[in-house]
Amino acid sequence: AGVFELQIHSFGPGPGPGAPRSPCSARLPCRLFFRVCLKPGLSEEAAESPCALGAALSARGPVYTEQPGAPAPDLPLPDGLLQVPFRDAWPGTFSFIIETWREELGDQIGGPAWSLLARVAGRRRLAAGGPWARDIQRAGAWELRFSYRARCEPPAVGTACTRLCRPRSAPSRCGPGLRPCAPLEDECEAPLVCRAGCSPEHGFCEQPGECRCLEGWTGPLCTVPVSTSSCLSPRGPSSATTGCLVPGPGPCDGNPCANGGSCSETPRSFECTCPRGFYGLRCEVSGVTCADGPCFNGGLCVGGADPDSAYICHCPPGFQGSNCEKRVDRCSLQPCRNGGLCLDLGHALRCRCRAGFAGPRCEHDLDDCAGRACANGGTCVEGGGAHRCSCALGFGGRDCRERADPCAARPCAHGGRCYAHFSGLVCACAPGYMGARCEFPVHPDGASALPAAPPGLRPGDPQRYL
């Protein structure tokens, strides 16, 4: 057994640009408190998973009111350590979550409102009994500085708090079979202490805190006799009778405790140890209140302090769910019109509009032709957010200001020569070809692939393209 201790040194704006807004104001003074959650091993568990090693809440810090115009300083902290007692061995590797909470102290009739300001998490190796370890963690624009250590509670010693020591009864040596307790040479290793309540007649232990049963007994405390009945695979001393040992029904069989409660046997029945937020004989009653910090992602908790009180989480933009636990993909609703690009910035939604469109959701179609004249008799055509001029014959370019060279694109096929003409272009076809663009070959017998040429035109004569 032992205690994990956490000392918060400072909580305030981190280095660099973008200092956070002070969490308190003259109208809404507030104070801070901290919550630590510990889990064994180097788990990557979600913040909502149980704090299997334990959790602790700090006291409330001094009331703080922002000075108008002043940058957010390091905020006043609660006094004292956060202490998380652990009953069993210290695991050596652990995961932590440290949350900084804001308690608003306005003239709220229904009691204070809580909201999560910052959450930091990490995974560390730590031997019990060692010195304080210092750490700095950042959450957004906030910075948290803290120290932590794990220490064993007497009589436990060692890096895992599993060895037990007692002062020597005799000055010269330890009792039979017991070694001196390094580094405390003036103390002796004590006999193992089994799990509390472990039956002294039917149970024993090889590690502190465990309870292993002798043949014929079962249950967490070895207090339940096993019944003998016939079965297929004989086991234990009764195999000679072709029977086997089957545990009798225990009060904790099937775990009667709901919502993750743990069951322990009592002389008469069972007892449920309920996780935080649940109560009742079988942990069947949910009593989550704002004090349990149920709102995630900066959600503001609203609710009374009574376990029967409801609570709701007022969620910041970009989050939803009863605990603000779900990130909203607001762009999936395709809020940007006319092909605009959607950007979810977390605190707000932005639409990047295509040319010719404007407005928060690109809903306004700009009049592309407004104030734009097409020269030389061209007409303006609106469409797709970009204006376009349909130019009169002989003119081109964006605004029809350029005189078009109809021969620039080499429109006459099969070596025909192109001549610019006031009404367009004329192709003078090479021998053997005819047509407006010299595209048709003339057959050797004088017939063509087209109806006969109009009167007055011989094959090979220039043909005007109208």
Epitope: L28, G106, Q108, G110, A113, L300, V302, I312, C313, H314, C315, P316, F319, Q320, G321, S322, C324
Partner: nanobody, 115 residues
Framework: EVQLVESGGGEVQPGGSLRLSCGPS????????VGWWRQAPGKQRNLVAG???????NYAQSVKGRFTISRDNAKNTVYLQMSSLRAEDTAVYYC?????????WGQGTLVTVKP
């Protein structure tokens, strides 16, 4: 300062029903979380039912299955439908709304459940 106005309270027999209304008020908009609190004599005020700004509802354990909270954003009004009323539901019921910056309360309406 703008206040919320409750109506619909009164005296009712055990097992009876009442419907409380709050509003209309320009305060009750879809971006606010709204709720009904109650305070019995000598007890602290507790949230009976609430609807968050993202539409999640929650109820006190003691009223689940009996009370229903709803909101009409078009009418800027919040309702609390109470049925199977019990003596322990006797209290002053307060309408409530809040955003991140401000919170708003009504003056309260008395609900009395007695045979």
């Amino acid at each position: 300062e703008v206040q919320l106005v409750e109506s619909g309270g009164g005296e009712v027999q055990p097992g009876g029903s009442l419907r409380l209304s709050c509003g209309p008020s320009e305060i009750i908009t879809s971006d606010k979380s709204v709720g009904w609190w109650r305070q019995a004599p000598g007890k602290q005020r507790n949230l009976v039912a609430g609807i968050s700004n993202v539409g999640s509802t929650n109820y006190a354990q003691s009223v689940k299955g009996r009370f229903t909270i709803s909101r009409d954003n078009a009418k800027n009004t919040v309702y609390l439908q109470m049925s199977s009323l019990r003596a322990e539901d006797t209290a002053v019921y307060y309408c409530y709304a809040r955003d991140f910056e401000n919170e708003y309360w009504g003056q309260g309406t008395l609900v009395t459940v007695k045979p």
